[in-house]
Interface confidence: medium
């Protein structure tokens, strides 16, 4: 299939509230009108789909209501935010971009962003 370059940061540290954001940028070879973005998680050689959204160029990304992902698009950049992360979710998060329409179909897969999640220390009990 037609390959497309996708760039994303190598490492991101999630916030104490379990939120991680990163930019996924693709080098669009053509004038796509509809783009599909998928976030994959790779851990222990297992790859699972975290979330996916299809959007029209110039419009907002729409993830499913129960998705842990949100995002915005600007040109050939997608700003992705993953919420509700815990330490066990640490892993490599790969951005996959597909230019769906019009033909030809293009596929690009980033090298992945290593997201580190550290669970916050529980607050000590207080006598006050």
């Amino acid at each position: 299939c037609k390959a497309m370059h996708v760039a994303q940061p190598a490492v991101v540290l999630a916030s104490s509230r379990g939120i991680a954001s990163f930019v996924c940028e693709y080098a669009s070879p053509g004038k796509a009108t509809e783009v599909r973005v998928t976030v994959l998680r790779q851990a222990d050689s297992q790859v699972t789909e975290v979330c996916a959204a299809t959007y029209m160029m110039g419009n907002e990304l729409t993830f499913l209501d129960d998705s842990i992902c949100t995002g915005t698009s600007s040109g050939n950049q997608v700003n992705l935010t993953i919420q509700g992360l815990r330490a066990m979710d640490t892993g490599l998060y790969i951005c996959k971009v597909e230019l769906m329409y019009p033909p030809p179909y293009y596929l690009g897969i980033g090298n992945g962003t290593q997201i580190y999640v550290i669970d916050p220390e529980p607050c000590p009990d207080s006598d006050f």
């Epitope: 299939c1 509809e34 299809t54 769906m100 019009p102 033909p103 030809p104 179909y105």
Partner: antibody
Framework: QVQLVQTGGGVVQPGRSLRLSCAAS????????MSWVRQAPGKGLEWVSA????????YYADSVKGRFTISRDNSKNTLYLQMNSLRAEDTAVYYC???????????WGRATLVTVSS | EIVLTQSPGTLSLSPGERATLSCRAS???????LAWYQQKPGQAPRLLIY???SRATGIPDRFSGSGSGTDFTLTISRLEPEDFAVYYC?????????FGGGTKVEIK
């Protein structure tokens, strides 16, 4: 295996309208881009129109642009082709077909004959 | 628009013979995005080959595709009685999607 059942063909006068339907079995209908392809009597195949799986993107051949409208209702697993201002040269057998990601046609309906004649 | 020209228009052969069908594009078909279809009278087309050389599910291995750029070939190694039909090529490397005019393979 998805199956495509077409309805809505017939004889119509020039300038009039007709709507074709293509009902798909299977729960993955919204995963497929869909197209309409036609074949004039004794002639070859001509791609007419396509629509993305979400229905958000539509494409037309120049020969039908502005006259035909492709749409889909994913809740009903049905594809439509609204044909307005029909001309004699639109007379053909019309096929609905599923598109792979790569835009070849992997599954075809059984055909609907549209005859435009006065 | 990419124009596809198929030749010959008609191929007269006997069962057991080898059939070689040509599809030539007016400009290069990127990534070999070319498909072949078989159509029998009164039936819908059936996908045989995609990506210029990959056989679709359930297609016998006597059908093979080759080529790149502007020249593509469909080969049927040994014609079976059910192979006599019209064959179309289609490019999907650019919009609009276009088909060739077809090659009819008939019994000699």
């Amino acid at each position: 295996q998805v199956q495509l059942v077409q309805t809505g063909g017939g004889v119509v006068q020039p300038g009039r309208s007709l709507r074709l339907s293509c009902a798909a079995s299977g729960s993955t209908f919204s995963s497929y881009a869909m197209s309409w392809v036609r074949q004039a009597p004794g002639k070859g195949l001509e791609w007419v129109s396509a629509i993305s799986g979400s229905g958000g993107s539509t494409y037309y051949a120049d020969s039908v642009k502005g006259r035909f409208t492709i749409s889909r209702d994913n809740s009903k697993n049905t594809l439509y082709l609204q044909m307005n201002s029909l001309r004699a040269e639109d007379t053909a057998v019309y096929y609905c077909a599923t598109n792979s990601l790569y835009w070849y046609f992997d599954l075809w309906g059984r055909a609907t004959l549209v005859t435009v004649s006065s | 628009e990419i124009v596809l020209t198929q030749s010959p228009g008609t191929l007269s052969l006997s069962p057991g013979e080898r059939a070689t069908l040509s599809c030539r594009a007016s400009q290069s078909v990127s990534s070999s995005y070319l498909a072949w279809y078989q159509q029998k009278p009164g039936q819908a087309p059936r996908l045989l080959i995609y990506g210029a050389s990959s056989r679709a599910t359930g297609i016998p291995d006597r059908f093979s595709g080759s080529g790149s750029g502007t020249d593509f070939t469909l080969t049927i190694s040994r014609l079976e009685p059910e192979d006599f039909a019209v064959y179309y090529c289609q490019q999907y490397g650019s919009s609009p999607l276009t088909f060739g005019g077809g090659t009819k393979v008939e019994i000699k």
